[in-house]
């Protein structure tokens, strides 16, 4: 059967590709270490916003995360342009130390697998997806109850490196990178009337840092 | 290699619609947005609207809303612009342009529209 | 909606010349600047992403610089391949807008 030829043909050259990746591959390295900085393109895709806690000043938030960057030692030539991969793979290659500024707690889903995405395109360009739910801190005054406006942040960047090794960009510029998805709002009491997104570096005692910003702005009803 | 080819020249007649496609190699346009650009001739560039192909979320500047649909087919890896009611004005070449890497990064040929009785 | 401003249409260079183009934003833009490269036969490129950042295959001789609303594209040694006309584009805030555009000749 030529089908069944061309599939274990196929199946044989996936193999050998990511064998060939692998091979000599040091993943607590970051890709352009001691040549450039690594730059990760990131975007949200808010598929629930809420609940909204007053007493707790926090929010519950599910998004998909999607990060893009590129790995010069992740090249290669093949029949096929791109590489699908499972979540096993991820823990083979660089990926970013992104964590939650502003985040309580981080929930990664695993049901009935770990919901991660990894793709790898033949010029090394990866993109990494996962599905998160995140219970983040959100200060709100209060002094304006019932007529009160507030705006909650999700707050994210590199654990361990500084600006000058990592350095994060809105995938969609500053306009169009987090989206809320039409029937997102898991609101009661409150409007969520928009959001907007930016950047700020953070200096403490082991450098600068970026944190990327989202801000949802929401309102009482 | 990363490559958008568009559809190619339209020469259609006042009122008529007409629909332009891109069609993507070497990535998945599910990883990215696709962007549709209005060039007039001897002018600069316009932003018509954008689709994001994997939950086909569409954001079009408010001059080009009514005027423009843009859709996406996942499993063609192509991106689509309809244009209807047409005017002279509406002639102009239309390029499709993808977002990689936070800009329009792999831009199509360009499709020329001639509207025209 | 941003504007974008070129203020220079034109640009007559020679070959080996350094040329610089600038553009500037009604606002500020936080550094979310792009420019597109437009040749003759309509065909476009992005060369520089996030003000200075050289898109894959770019030559080494482009360079982007600015900050706030003031951005300029700089080509170091001007070659015949150069010859097109230049947009800058930002992407702060939506719509995008792109710049009306620099044309660079051969003097």
């Known amino acids: 059967n030529i089908q069944e030829d061309e599939a274990k043909n196929n199946i044989t050259i996936f193999t050998r590709i990511l064998d060939r990746l692998l091979d000599g591959y040091d993943n607590r390295l970051r890709p352009g270490l001691g040549d450039s900085i690594t730059e990760v393109f990131t975007n949200i895709y808010v598929t629930s916003f809420g609940p909204v806690s007053d007493t707790d000043m926090e929010y519950t938030i599910d998004v998909f995360f999607r990060q893009k960057w590129k790995d010069e030692r992740l090249k290669f030539k093949g029949p096929m342009n791109i590489l699908r991969l499972n979540n096993l793979m991820a823990s083979k290659i660089w990926t970013p130390d992104t964590f939650f500024h502003n985040g309580k707690k981080s929930v990664a889903h695993n049901m009935t697998m770990p919901n991660k995405l990894l793709r790898i395109q033949d010029d090394g360009t990866l993109l990494y997806t996962m599905r998160l739910t995140v219970q983040a801190e959100c200060p709100m005054h209060l002094e304006d109850f019932p007529m009160d406006a507030h705006s909650c942040p999700l707050k994210f960047g590199s654990y361990a490196y500084t600006t000058s090794e990592v350095t994060y960009i809105w995938t969609y510029n500053a306009s169009d990178s987090v989206q809320v998805a039409p029937d997102g709002s898991r609101l009661n009491q409150y409007d969520l009337l928009g959001q907007s997104i930016g950047k700020e570096t953070i200096k403490s005692s082991t450098g600068e840092y970026t944190v990327m910003t989202a801000h949802f702005h929401l309102k009482r009803k | 290699e990363v490559q958008l080819q568009q559809s190619g020249a339209e020469l259609v007649k006042p009122g008529a619609s007409v629909k332009l496609s891109c069609t993507a190699s070497?990535?998945?346009?599910?990883?990215?947005?696709m962007y549709w650009v209005k060039q007039r001739p001897e002018q600069g560039l316009e932003w018509i609207g954008r689709?994001?192909?994997?939950?086909?979320?569409?954001k079009y500047d408010p001059k080009f809303q009514g005027k423009a649909t843009i859709t996406a087919d996942t499993s063609s890896n192509t991106a689509y612009l309809q244009l209807s009611s047409l005017t002279s004005e509406d002639t102009a070449v239309y390029y499709c342009?993808?977002?990689?890497?936070?800009?329009?990064?792999?831009w199509g040929q360009g499709t020329t529209l001639t509207v025209s009785s | 909606d941003i504007q974008m401003t070129q203020t220079t249409s034109s640009l007559s260079a020679s070959l080996g010349d350094r040329v610089t183009i600038s553009c500037r934003a009604s606002?500020?833009?936080?550094?979310?600047l792009n420019w597109y490269q437009q040749k003759p036969d309509g065909t476009v490129k992005l060369l520089i992403y996030?003000?200075?950042r050289l898109h894959s295959g770019v030559p080494s001789r482009f360079s982007g610089s600015g900050s706030g609303t003031d951005y300029s594209l700089t080509i170091s040694n001007l070659e015949q391949e150069d010859i097109a006309t230049y947009f800058c584009?930002?992407?702060?805030?939506?719509?995008?807008?792109f710049g009306g555009g620099t044309k660079l000749e051969i003097k």
């Open positions: 342009a993808s977002n990689y890497y936070g800009s329009f990064d792999y």
């Open positions: 584009q930002q992407g702060n805030t939506l719509p995008p807008t």
């Open positions: 070497g990535f998945n346009i599910k990883d990215t947005y």
């Open positions: 689709i994001d192909p994997a939950n086909g979320n569409t």
């Open positions: 996030y003000t200075s």
């Open positions: 606002q500020d833009i936080s550094n979310y």
